[in-house]
C-alpha cells in the first residue's frame, strides 16, 4: 500500500528547481531566491552557500544547484567543496600556528601549500648529490657508480637516485 | 618518461669548437636539472657540466672555462658549447636529465679532437 501511495505521490512530479508546497496543496513552487532543489520530488529547497569574507563565487547558485566556492587570492581551498581556506605560504615555507615558516635545512616546499619534506636521500640508493636542496627544491641525485663504468651500456633505463647534502667532486 | 637525444658531436681540430644538443621529449623538462658526462674507451663516464632546472651550474675542473652549458626551456633543449678542445677531450658525450631521485640517459654522441 505504501509503494502504491509513493507513485501517485503528485510531489514525485515535481522537477529539480521546484519543491512541492504542501501549503499550497502539493502542487510544484519554484524555489525561492536564494535556494535550490538539485533533484525533483523534494519538499523544500536548500539554502544556497554564500562564499563570504576569504571565499569567493566560483559558480552562481542556481535554482537547481547550489553555489560552489573557492578562496581568495592568497588562500587556497581545503576539505571537500572548498570548504575552508588556508593561508598561502611562499615556496620554500610552510604554515604553521605561527605563520609561514621557512623550511628547516634539509627539508623543502616547492608549492605555495603543504608541509616541508626532507630531500631526498641519494645515499639510500648507492647515488651521489647531483644538484643540492634548497628550501624550494629537492634535490637531485646523479646516476648510480654502476651506470658511470666503462661496461655501462649507452642506453641506460631511467635511473632512480637520491642525499642532502653536498656535491659530487 | 622523458626522453633524452644528444647531437652535434664530430671530428675538430686541437683548439676548435663544438656544441652538443641534448634535446627532451616532453613538457616537464624544465622542471628536471641536466648533466653532461662523457666516457673515454675504457674509463669510467665523468660528469663534465650540470645545470639545474634554475639554470645554476656546475663544470668539472678539467672544463672550467672552456665548456658552457646552457638550456633553453622554449626549445626543451640543454647545449654544452665546447671551446678550445683537447684531444683528452676525446669521448662519447652523454646527456644525463634527473629530478629528484629518477634519471634517465640519452644515448651518446661521440666527440672526437685530433688533428
Known amino acids: 500500500f505504501e509503494r502504491t501511495r509513493s507513485l501517485q505521490d503528485p510531489c514525485s512530479n515535481c522537477p529539480a528547481g521546484t519543491f512541492c508546497d504542501n501549503n499550497r496543496n502539493q502542487i510544484c513552487s519554484p524555489c525561492p531566491p536564494n535556494s535550490f532543489s538539485s533533484a525533483g520530488g523534494q519538499r523544500t529547497c536548500d539554502i544556497c552557500r554564500q562564499c563570504k569574507g576569504v571565499f569567493r563565487t566560483r559558480k552562481e547558485c542556481s535554482s537547481t544547484s547550489n553555489a560552489e566556492c573557492d578562496c581568495t587570492p592568497g588562500f587556497h581551498c581545503l576539505g571537500a567543496g572548498c570548504s575552508m581556506c588556508e593561508q598561502d605560504c611562499k615556496q620554500g615555507q610552510e604554515l604553521t600556528k605561527k605563520g609561514c615558516k621557512d623550511c628547516c635545512f634539509g627539508t623543502f616546499n616547492d608549492q605555495k601549500r603543504g608541509i616541508c619534506r626532507p630531500w631526498t636521500n641519494c645515499s639510500l640508493d648507492g647515488k651521489s648529490v647531483l644538484v643540492n636542496g634548497t628550501k624550494e627544491r629537492d634535490v637531485v641525485c646523479g646516476p648510480s657508480p654502476a651506470d658511470l663504468s666503462p661496461g655501462a651500456s649507452s642506453v641506460t633505463p631511467p635511473a632512480p637516485a637520491r642525499e642532502p647534502g653536498h656535491s659530487p667532486q | 618518461a622523458v626522453q633524452l637525444v644528444e647531437s652535434g658531436g664530430g671530428l675538430v681540430q686541437p683548439g676548435g669548437s663544438l656544441r652538443l644538443s641534448c634535446a627532451a621529449s616532453?613538457?616537464?623538462?624544465?622542471?628536471?636539472?641536466v648533466a653532461w658526462y662523457r666516457q673515454a674507451p675504457g674509463k669510467p663516464r665523468e660528469l663534465v657540466a650540470v645545470?639545474?632546472?634554475?639554470?645554476?651550474?656546475r663544470y668539472a675542473d678539467s672544463v672550467k672555462g672552456r665548456f658552457t652549458i646552457s638550456r633553453d626551456n622554449a626549445k626543451n633543449t640543454v647545449y654544452l658549447q665546447m671551446n678550445s678542445l683537447k684531444p683528452e677531450d676525446t669521448a662519447v658525450y652523454y646527456c644525463?636529465?634527473?629530478?629528484?631521485?629518477?634519471?634517465?640517459w640519452g644515448q651518446g654522441t661521440q666527440v672526437t679532437v685530433s688533428s
Open positions: 644525463f636529465g634527473g629530478r629528484s631521485s629518477m634519471g634517465t
Open positions: 616532453g613538457s616537464i623538462f624544465s622542471s628536471y636539472a
Open positions: 645545470i639545474s632546472s634554475e639554470g645554476t651550474t
